[in-house]
Amino acid sequence: YDFTNCDFEKIKAAYLSTISKDLITYMSGTKSTEFNNTVSCSNRPHCLTEIQSLTFNPTAGCASLAKEMFAMKTKAALAIWCPGYSETQINATQAMKKRRKRKVTTNKCLEQVSQLQGLWRRFNRPLLKQQ
């Protein structure tokens, strides 16, 4: 999906009002410096691409993020504020329903959510100084 035509300010507002808090809740008890940055993004569409990938694509050691509160709110925000996003996600959602629903917070998941926090911060960053 091409995130170029999303309403970035509306997504930013959704992040600031709820998604950010849910990410903090998930990470509670974890030091903010515990994980180094291993993923970055270079503009708002790119950030959303990487956020979608980390939030909804199962990875080795962390297959369970899509059912978390922050993930569901992320999905809702993208569905509302990114034209045509919902249609592209129907097949992915059906595939996800077939997986086992076992809620385990692994260290790998914590690391992944830490990377998500970094990506969201970059998405919401103010304009950089004139370099």
């Epitope: 291993t38 993923v39 970055s40 270079s42 503009n43 790119h46 990487e50 960053r125 100084k129 370099q131």
Partner: antibody, heavy 122, light 108 residues
Framework: QMQLVESGGGVVQPGRSLRLSCAAS????????MHWVRQAPGKGLEWVAV????????HYADSVKGRFTITRDNSKNTLNLQMNSLRAEDTAVYYC???????????????WGQGTMVTVSS | SYVLTQPPSVSVAPGQTARITCGGN??????VHWYQQKPGQAPVLVVY???DRPSWIPERFSGSNSGNTATLTISRGEAGDEADYYC???????????FGGGTKLTVL
């Protein structure tokens, strides 16, 4: 463990070519800008070139423009520097480094390799 | 092209504060990054975006940037801080990375 490992250095005669490689691991390579920086013996750091996170664009120092080419292969997590028409003044340790990028601005170089030595001598 | 100027050397007594400067035209409008390099080793990022510090760098390292000068401050200097220090910016007008000439810090 995030890591950059350079290879391909060696001794080469003036006017000849050499290709350096940098293997990345432990991070999502395709999301970072990548640089080559060099350091001549006893001298300071000199930036050589940078390639965008997606390979879309490249920038070069005037001292190497037209002679060096920076490329990347995001499917293999590798960065390359093709060095042609080498000169004695290209003798240096060559480091690769990663840099977060925002739009067309490159940020700090937060991870560096250990470097590979290139000696240009007849 | 854009030029960054650093003093070739700075000395500090153990436990005292060292300040390394980096000068450039209207430097305060740019984000400055600082690197530490010990002999035979690769550079290490110690301060980025003027004053932010990577998680692995001690709080003794801090930075500031305004006007035409950026400053790297190392408080409570230790023997292990002896190294070369380089400032760096991205020059958007020319799409080039620029490094300062480097400053050799000696802990007396």
């Amino acid at each position: 463990q995030m890591q950059l490992v350079e290879s391909g250095g060696g001794v080469v005669q003036p006017g000849r070519s050499l290709r350096l490689s940098c293997a990345a691991s432990g991070f999502t390579f395709r999301t970072y800008g990548m640089h080559w920086v060099r350091q001549a013996p006893g001298k300071g750091l000199e930036w050589v070139a940078v390639v965008w996170y997606d390979g879309y664009d490249t920038h070069y120092a005037d001292s190497v423009k037209g002679r060096f080419t920076i490329t990347r292969d995001n499917s293999k997590n590798t960065l390359n520097l093709q060095m042609n028409s080498l000169r004695a003044e290209d003798t240096a340790v060559y480091y690769c480094s990663r840099s977060p990028q925002w739009e067309d601005i490159f940020e700090s170089m937060d991870i560096w390799g250990q470097g590979t030595m290139v000696t240009v001598s007849s | 092209s854009y030029v960054l100027t650093q003093p070739p050397s700075v000395s500090v007594a153990p436990g005292q504060t060292a300040r390394i400067t980096c000068g450039g035209n209207n430097l305060g409008s740019k984000s400055v990054h600082w690197y530490q390099q010990k002999p035979g080793q690769a550079p290490v990022l110690v301060v980025y975006d003027d004053s932010d510090r990577p998680s692995w760098i001690p709080e003794r390292f801090s930075g500031s940037n305004s006007g035409n000068t950026a400053t790297l401050t190392i408080s409570r200097g230790e023997a292990g801080d002896e190294a070369d220090y380089y400032c760096q910016v991205w020059d958007m007008s020319s799409d080039l990375v620029v490094f300062g000439g480097g400053t050799k810090l000696t802990v007396l």
